[in-house]
């Protein structure tokens, strides 16, 4: 069985008050993506459904924007946004693929992007 791979933006950092794009990409599979969920630890941020489009959780509507693509843009970052984010790809027939991103929001103006990595 050929299974896919989730590529994410990995460990990233951004400046307080700024914005950041969270991106995941599913490759090496012909599975059909039916839905992508974005979660911050134990909170649902957004859903992108293949048929119904985007839904942003009400509590994040002011600071979360859909896209680009299946990614998610976080705006007006605060230090409380530091933590783990998960992209969850619901596919058929493979099942569910999960990618992890760690975001660190920095007080200083020095914010470097980490290297991309893959979760097999």
């Amino acid at each position: 069985m050929m299974t896919g791979t989730i590529e994410t933006t990995g460990n990233i950092s951004a400046e307080k008050g700024g914005s950041i794009i969270l991106q995941c990409h599913l490759s090496s599979t012909t599975a059909q993506v039916t839905q992508v969920n974005w979660e911050q630890q134990d909170q649902l941020l957004a859903i992108c459904n293949a048929d119904l489009g985007w839904h942003i959780s009400p509590s994040f509507k002011d600071r979360v924007a859909p896209g680009p693509g299946l990614g998610l843009t976080l705006q007006s970052l605060t230090v409380n946004d530091t933590g783990e984010y998960f992209c969850i790809y619901h596919t058929y027939p493979d099942g569910t693929y999960t990618g992890r991103i760690f975001l660190e929001v920095l007080e200083s103006s020095v914010a470097e992007h980490g290297a991309r990595f893959q979760i097999p």
Epitope: T3, N37, F86, T96
Partner: nanobody, 131 residues
Framework: EVQLAESGGGSVQAGGSLRLSCTTS????????MGWFRQAPGKEREGVAT???????????TYADSVKGRFTISLDKAKNTVYLQMNSLKPEDTAMYYC?????????????????????WGQGTQVTVSS
């Protein structure tokens, strides 16, 4: 120590229904992949259904083509139990049914019935469907 215990198997006529239960002990729920597999005599073990439940309590089920529309997998965290509701049973559904689970927060892709390498397995419950 994590333990999975299946129950609910038995003998049933074709067209009938059964509900299998898999009760977990020593297992925590966070970001979980759990599923049901089966093995008929002389055949390889095959995936039936899996359920992915996130830390935000969203869930997604995936089914093998052979059971889609007939079987339903669900999880009751409060009862530490995963269920497999089996309707419109066929003689070819006869097999030993096993519950499987990944360690919590293990990211092992994909969570689906075609993936064989789950971390924990139960002892199985027998389902026999006669025509």
């Amino acid at each position: 120590e994590v333990q999975l215990a299946e129950s609910g198997g038995g003998s049933v006529q074709a067209g009938g229904s059964l509900r299998l239960s898999c009760t977990t002990s020593g297992y925590t729920y966070s970001r979980n992949c759990m599923g049901w597999f089966r093995q008929a005599p002389g055949k390889e073990r095959e995936g039936v259904a899996t359920i992915y439940v996130s830390a935000a309590s969203t869930s997604f089920a995936t089914y093998a083509d052979s059971v889609k529309g007939r079987f339903t997998i669900s999880l009751d965290k409060a009862k530490n139990t995963v269920y497999l509701q089996m309707n419109s049973l066929k003689p070819e559904d006869t097999a030993m049914y096993y519950c499987a689970a990944d360690p919590p927060d293990r990211i092992s892709n994909p969570c689906g019935p075609r993936r064989p390498d789950f971390g924990y397995w139960g002892q199985g419950t027998q389902v026999t469907v006669s025509s």
